[in-house]
């Protein structure tokens, strides 16, 4: 079989700080040198990307600057972790992987995870 | 809007050459890998070449390895194919392609006709 | 390099009809990695169904994809006068990335 599996955790609650930490771990078919991993979104049937890195096997993960995702990759497997997440934002988020390098091009879609957002309440105000 | 234009077709003889470019506008091309796919006249689709986000990986079909490239200019939205060492076999329109968000071709564009011949 | 062969080649339906048509792989593909394009004379192929079974954006609902493996169906419920075409399947989970022949679908 040509597919590249990949397997995610179904749901993810994030954290009372809008954090939202899972594993997107891949079955490479081949030995690849460069990985690029994106984070979808699904709402509807509308995807659009969340972020994206592309590391060498063996190195960090890098994604941009202003990038609401950080990550750290252990063989085939990588810790994503999405910040400033709000009640809006909850949804399915995909994990595709793309070996890049060596030849041939591998592609994998995860089946998603969904994140669950809680906006924390309000601290009343004080009387003092 | 959301669109691909291609140009840059036309005849050509035997071991000629052309350049292909492809124009992209209302979507971030940097986030979209690219294809070319071309169609022989009365024929089947065709893939024939794939470049990575920034350009820095690409793939050919074995029919045009060695004679054709595949390139990109994302600060100009712009793909291009540099075809060398044309045959009549690669008489075709010729089609660029986004590969989408989850890898299907998601958005063509008009197609652009190549014809080889002497 | 995986081969998809698609079946028939030309299909002669009546309008309001359903059709049927077929896509088999030399080897398996994740469902996640299978799509089908129509195409009409004279116009570029769109994009009808990815993921072997999730209609892209404006497909009307009489589309529908199934299957998994090696063996992969379209199926149009109730033929329109604008779906006679050809229909090709492609996968695109590996390099090279390969295309079916193509069905025509006529009218009857």
């Known amino acids: 079989c040509k597919a590249m599996h990949v397997a995610q955790p179904a749901v993810v609650l994030a954290s009372s700080r809008g954090i939202a930490s899972f594993v997107c771990e891949y079955a490479s078919p081949g030995k690849a040198t460069e990985v690029r991993v994106t984070v979808l979104r699904q709402a509807d049937s509308q995807v659009t990307e969340v972020c994206a890195a592309t590391y060498m096997m063996g190195n960090e993960l890098t994604f941009l600057d202003d990038s609401i995702c950080t990550g750290t990759s252990s063989g085939n497997q990588v810790n994503l972790t999405i910040q400033g997440l709000r009640a809006m934002d909850t949804g399915l988020y995909i994990c595709k992987v793309e070996l890049m390098y060596p030849p041939p091009y591998y592609l994998g879609i995860g089946n998603g995870t969904q994140i669950y957002v809680i906006d924390p309440e309000p601290c009343p105000d004080s009387d003092f | 809007e959301v669109q691909l234009v291609e140009s840059g077709g036309g005849l050509v003889k035997p071991g000629g050459s052309l350049r292909l470019s492809c124009a992209a506008s209302?979507?971030?091309?940097?986030?979209?890998?690219m294809h070319w796919v071309r169609q022989a006249p009365g024929k089947g689709l065709e893939w024939v070449s794939f470049?990575?986000?920034?350009?820095?990986?690409?793939y050919y079909a074995d029919s045009v390895k060695g004679r054709f490239t595949i390139s990109r200019d994302n600060a100009k939205n712009s793909l291009y194919l540099q075809m060398n060492s044309l045959r009549a076999e690669d008489t075709a329109v010729y089609y660029c392609?986004?590969?989408?968000?989850?890898?299907?071709?998601?958005?063509w564009g008009q197609g652009t006709m190549v014809t080889v011949s002497s | 390099e995986i081969v998809l062969t698609q079946s028939p080649g030309t299909l002669s339906v009546s309008p309001g009809e359903r059709a049927t048509l077929s896509c088999r792989a030399s080897?398996?593909?994740?469902?996640?990695?299978l799509a089908w394009y129509q195409q009409k004379p004279g116009q570029a192929p769109r994009l009808l169904i990815y993921?072997?079974?999730s209609r892209a954006t404006g497909i009307p609902d009489r589309f529908s994809g199934s299957g998994s493996g090696t063996d992969f169906t379209l199926t149009i419920s109730r033929l329109e006068p604008e779906d006679f075409a050809v229909y090709y399947c492609?996968?695109?989970?590996?390099?090279?990335?390969?295309f079916g022949q193509g069905t025509k679908v006529e009218i009857k």
């Open positions: 993921g072997a079974f």
């Open positions: 392609a986004r590969g989408g968000l989850l890898g299907p071709f998601d958005l």
């Open positions: 492609q996968q695109y989970g590996s390099s090279p990335w390969t």
């Open positions: 470049i990575s986000y920034d350009g820095n990986h690409k």
């Open positions: 080897q398996s593909v994740g469902s996640s990695y």
């Open positions: 209302g979507f971030t091309f940097s986030s979209y890998t």
